[in-house]
């Protein structure tokens, strides 16, 4: 599986949209999770509602939103008021029983507005502190906050 | 900007020890993982040492070409990093690079120091 | 044991230019690293695919389990270096031998 690079600006909204084969997948959960490291557990953030016919009813954990479309095969997760600390490597993943199906892993980058400083270039990349964790940028180009991803099969 | 430097190279003797210390700033040091990384001179480059995070229990692994002879350890509260090598040999000669990986929220994004060179030599 | 292909190869302005990395056993991402003559490795390429800061578009990883490659489309000058694969899946973290990449 590609990786998908999407950016968002601190203090946004930035929406992930994963989609997948929706027969395939049909009655399965589906969760957005954080890779901790290279072989590390994928931290669970949020997953769709317990009852699958209910999906579709949007389910919060914290700042982060996830909602599922199960006929037509989208997921969608929406990280609102985006920090530093939310930069990583996120999964979508279809739930069945234990066992959990990547359907696709996506960088999460934090872009701090240029305009809150005034001396800034064409992008303003704060220093990491304890509270700001993931201020490193790690591409300048801009991108579309809001991503379909392909099926997966 | 973050930030490793490298110190503590120098002129050693067959047989001698030597102390690395690498200074971390401008990231949250704590919650990284930290590494060595060894290139001798016209050669490749070999990682030896890391040292995982607290949340991590500070777990240490080892390169087999040095782990008889290796320590590596880090002082959160100071963000500091450092190597001991003992019973130094002249292939032990090289440029010693500091490597933040692994650990914390960017565990994939890597930092590198400048290196610091140490010659083993009569 | 990671093994690069090829040790040393050369390559005019504006060619396509691909290198390989074929590791021993499956790991989960590779890592690329750009090393010039008196200066430390710079991070090229993580994540198998994701370019880091400063790199040109006109690098690309890529790659799955056992085979990973780096690839320059339209060559430059300023390309010339040792590129450096890294697992960091599992204890060794080794890194492959370099590919060297040369200017016609």
């Known amino acids: 599986l590609n990786t998908t690079v999407l950016q968002g600006m601190a203090g946004q909204s930035l929406r992930v949209s994963c989609t997948y084969d929706a027969l395939k997948h049909w009655g399965r959960r589906k969760a957005w999770c954080r890779q901790l490291g290279e072989e590390g557990p994928c931290q669970r953030v949020v997953s769709t509602h317990g009852v699958w016919l209910l999906a579709f009813l949007k389910k919060r954990n914290g700042s982060t939103v996830i909602a599922d479309d199960t006929l037509a095969g989208t997921v969608t997760i929406t990280l609102k008021n985006l920090q530093a600390g939310d930069a990583g490597l996120y999964q979508c993943q279809s739930l069945r029983g234990r066992e959990a199906e990547v359907l696709q892993k996506v960088l999460v980058e934090v872009l701090e507005d240029p305009l809150d400083d005034q001396d800034a270039g064409d992008l303003w990349v704060p220093e990491e502190s304890s509270s700001f964790e993931g201020a490193q940028v790690e591409h300048s180009t801009s991108r579309n906050q809001e991503t379909s991803f392909p099926p997966t099969s | 900007e973050v930030q490793l430097v490298e110190s503590g190279g120098g002129l050693v003797q067959p047989k001698g020890s030597l102390k690395l210390s690498c200074a971390a700033s401008?990231?949250?040091?704590?919650?990284?993982?930290m590494n060595w990384v060894r290139q001798a001179p016209g050669k490749g480059l070999e990682w030896i040492a890391r040292?995982?995070?607290?949340?991590?229990?500070?777990?240490?692994y080892y390169a087999d070409s040095v782990k008889d002879r290796i320590t590596c350890s880090r002082d959160d509260s100071e963000n500091m990093f450092y190597l001991q090598l003992s019973s130094l040999k002249t292939e032990d000669t090289a440029m010693y690079y500091c490597?933040?990986?692994?650990?914390?929220?960017?565990?994939?994004?890597?930092?590198w120091g400048t290196g610091t060179t140490v010659t083993v030599s009569t | 044991v990671l093994t690069q292909s090829p040790a040393l190869m050369s390559a005019s302005p504006g060619e396509k230019v691909t290198m390989t990395c074929s590791a021993s056993?499956?790991?989960?991402?590779m890592y690329w690293y750009q090393q010039k003559p008196r200066s430390s490795p710079k991070p090229w390429i993580y994540?198998?695919?994701i370019l880091a800061s400063g790199v040109p578009a006109r690098f690309s990883g890529s790659g799955s389990g056992t085979s990973y490659s780096l690839t320059i489309n339209n060559m430059e000058a300023e390309d010339a270096a040792t590129y450096y694969c890294?697992?960091?899946?599992?204890?060794?973290?080794?890194f492959g031998g370099g590919t060297k990449l040369v200017i016609k």
């Open positions: 490597v933040r990986h692994g650990d914390g929220n960017l565990w994939y994004i890597d930092v």
């Open positions: 401008g990231f949250s040091f704590n919650t990284y993982a």
């Open positions: 040292i995982r995070s607290k949340s991590n229990n500070y777990a240490t």
């Open positions: 056993s499956s790991v989960s991402y």
């Open positions: 994540l198998t695919s």
């Open positions: 890294q697992q960091w899946s599992f204890n060794p973290y080794t």
